[in-house]
């Protein structure tokens, strides 16, 4: 697991941004913009919402999501879960890496009250080449996208 | 354009801390302590609230602000916006990099209730030599400064 | 204080995770898992809740804690303080490094309301060999542990 940064290689890094297509409503992970605006990929890959590791090592992975609403949608759980999850070719289930639970709706005492909240996650995990990291938000109906600055997902090798 | 970390160079990094002079009330960005206590600059510069990049590259930039109040000030917007913005001499507008919106006042159901909240932002962006990054909070009246540990601003090259 | 990353050395990094034994109720810092699951130590050491620095340098240190409850326990302060603190052999008191204050209980308008909140801290600090960093949460009764993904503590040299 000893990881050395070779001088002729770039240090893997990425910052992916929220876009209109991020929220699929399909129960899958959030999708991200990889090339436009502030988004970039350097020494990492992307596939169907996932950052794909090309070089094994320890990575600081992070995500922020902007939450907001007017009161709370009917049927909305009082808990919002925002997490970073790992998919690996050798294991059938996603593995939780970093997770937060919040109750932002509880702030709005009236059903017509506008509220905003933000959830940030970041931490160091070991990732093997070919492993994938995705972002999930339950309930994603409360994620508020705009211009890629409020909801995002990134990583860099440490 | 490939950026490699050369082993004989220090890696640019900085951590700036909140101080009594941070809040100007002028509509400008927050100002920061760069030398005292926990604050430092290494391979980055500072000017009028801005971290100034001296070496182009990808940087993880971050900021935390401590918010608090007793109820909500009259005329206070229900949304607090905390953001990291880029300034450059050759571009007329500030560019949003990372932004959060929160409604912390909504937590206080009574007008005399004391409340606290914190907003953290962090992400990787590409910065050119000479470009500046600043922190803005709207409404800055709710930022609570103390000793440099609760509100801060930093960056390091990845 | 000039710090160079030598190419033949591993870059110090660690990620420690919350466990059933994390909350001691003794007024001491939180304790952490260092070896199981997602937890690891690489070029850093651990002792009684503290990350112990073995190589002097600038480190990005971070912690997240998951808070939650049903209403608010009697006698609970309305403010929760989550902080990263430094212990050094040459100084008798802990030094605050990065701190957040939150009022998550204020979200729950009824005493039987379930609420969740999360606090994230991260920033760059200079640490000498032998210095220790710990996490404290006041009141720790509101920290919700599960599987190491919701409350954690880590660092890496920048």
């Amino acid at each position: 697991l000893i990881q050395e940064r070779r001088s002729h290689e770039v240090n893997p890094a990425a910052h992916l941004t929220g876009a209109n297509s991020s929220l699929t409503g399909s129960g899958g992970p959030l999708l991200w913009e990889t090339q436009l605006g502030l988004a970039f990929l350097r020494g990492l890959s992307y596939h169907d919402g996932a950052l794909v590791v090309t070089k094994a090592g320890y990575y600081y992975i992070y995500s922020k999501v902007q939450l907001g609403g007017v009161g709370c949608p009917l049927g909305l759980a009082s808990t919002i879960t925002h997490g970073l999850y790992k998919r690996t070719p050798r294991y059938p289930e996603e593995l939780e890496l970093l997770v937060s639970q919040q109750s932002p709706c509880g702030r709005a005492t009236s059903s017509s009250r506008v509220w905003w909240d933000s959830s940030f996650l970041g931490g160091v995990v070991h990732l093997e080449a070919g492993e994938k990291v995705v972002v999930r938000v339950l309930d994603e109906r409360l994620v508020r996208l705009r211009d890629g600055t409020r909801s995002y997902f990134g990583a860099f090798m440490v | 354009l490939i950026q490699e970390r050369r082993s004989h160079e220090v890696n640019p990094a900085a951590h700036l801390t909140g101080a009594n002079s941070s809040l100007t009330g002028s509509g400008g960005p927050l100002l920061w302590e760069t030398q005292l206590g926990l604050a430092f600059l290494r391979g980055l510069s500072y000017h009028d609230g801005a971290l100034v990049v001296t070496k182009a590259g990808y940087y993880y930039i971050y900021s935390k602000v401590q918010l608090g109040g007793v109820g909500c000030p009259l005329g206070l917007a229900s949304t607090i916006t905390h953001g990291l913005y880029k300034r450059t001499p050759r571009y007329p507008e500030e560019l949003e990099l990372l932004v959060s919106q929160q409604s912390p006042c909504g937590r206080a159901t009574s007008s005399s209730r004391v409340w606290w909240d914190s907003s953290f932002l962090g992400g990787v962006v590409h910065l050119e030599a000479g470009e500046k990054v600043v922190v803005r909070v709207l409404d800055e009246r709710l930022v609570r400064l103390r000793d440099g540990t609760r509100s801060y601003f930093g960056a390091f090259m990845v | 204080l000039i710090q160079e990353r030598r190419s033949h050395e591993v870059n110090p990094a660690a990620h420690l995770t919350g466990a059933n034994s994390s909350l001691t109720g003794s007024g001491g810092p939180l304790l952490w898992e260092t070896q199981l699951g997602l937890a690891f130590l690489r070029g850093l050491s651990y002792h009684d809740g503290a990350l112990v620095v073995t190589k002097a340098g600038y480190y990005y240190i971070y912690s997240k804690v998951q808070l939650g409850g049903v209403g608010c326990p009697l006698g609970l302060a309305s403010t929760i303080t989550h902080g990263l603190y430094k212990r050094t052999p040459r100084y008798p008191e802990e030094l605050e490094l990065l701190v957040s204050q939150q009022s998550p209980c204020g979200r729950a308008t009824s005493s039987s309301r379930v609420w969740w909140d999360s606090s994230f801290l991260g920033g760059v600090v200079h640490l000498e060999a032998g210095e220790k960093v710990v996490v404290r949460v006041l009141d720790e009764r509101l920290v919700r542990l599960r599987d190491g993904t919701r409350s954690y503590f880590g660092a890496f040299m920048v």
């Epitope: 290689e9 893997p12 436009l36 970039f40 992307y46 | - | -």
Partner: antibody, heavy 118, light 107 residues
Framework: QVQLVQSGAEVKKPGASVKVSCKAS????????IYWVRQAPGQGLEWIGY????????KYNQKFKDRVTMTRDTSISTAYMELSRLRSDDTAVYYC???????????WGQGTLVTVSS | EIVLTQSPDFQSVTPKEKVTITCRAS??????LHWYQQKPDQSPKLLIK???QSISGVPSRFSGSGSGTDFTLTINSLEAEDAATYYC?????????FGQGTKVEIK
Amino acid sequence: QVQLVQSGAEVKKPGASVKVSCKASGYTFTDYYIYWVRQAPGQGLEWIGYIDPYNGGTKYNQKFKDRVTMTRDTSISTAYMELSRLRSDDTAVYYCARTSGSSWFPYWGQGTLVTVSS
Amino acid sequence: EIVLTQSPDFQSVTPKEKVTITCRASQSISNNLHWYQQKPDQSPKLLIKYTYQSISGVPSRFSGSGSGTDFTLTINSLEAEDAATYYCQQSNRWPLTFGQGTKVEIK
């Protein structure tokens, strides 16, 4: 230094297919996307699509999506762009270009002239 | 799609003169605008990225400015080797698009 070397000129008949190659050197091939851009004689530049060399993921301009296929062979650090059902207005110089992470292009191949003529 | 319209289409300029080429976007593209130079029978060459950012190895006489929908490439003191066609490109929305080009000729 980064180099992108493309295959030689091709002459094709309408309805045929052409496959242009782009061999990369001077960097780790899987680290950056490869884009394809074309330029008809005396005309401007037109984006065709890109490929992620690591996993073969692609994004195509809607205008070409029914006719273009981008592939790669990581063992020889080479990307390919195949255009099928060629028409005379596909006559152009086809360029591969490499990003530095986002959608702008500091590195370009020398271009491959594809002539479609009956 | 975002349409980029350059003006003028053609410019004949004497050496040492200042050259200004504009690029107008059909909708706001923030600062996500890049400039390329292409000489006859050569590949395009990146001159400026993100509206104003200079590129290593590109002479300092080339500069960029603008924001939102209106952008400018300036060549401060034209040299004979600058005879070429110049293109703008946006990276704000898919599909990526280029301007139609501005040909600069030396008088």
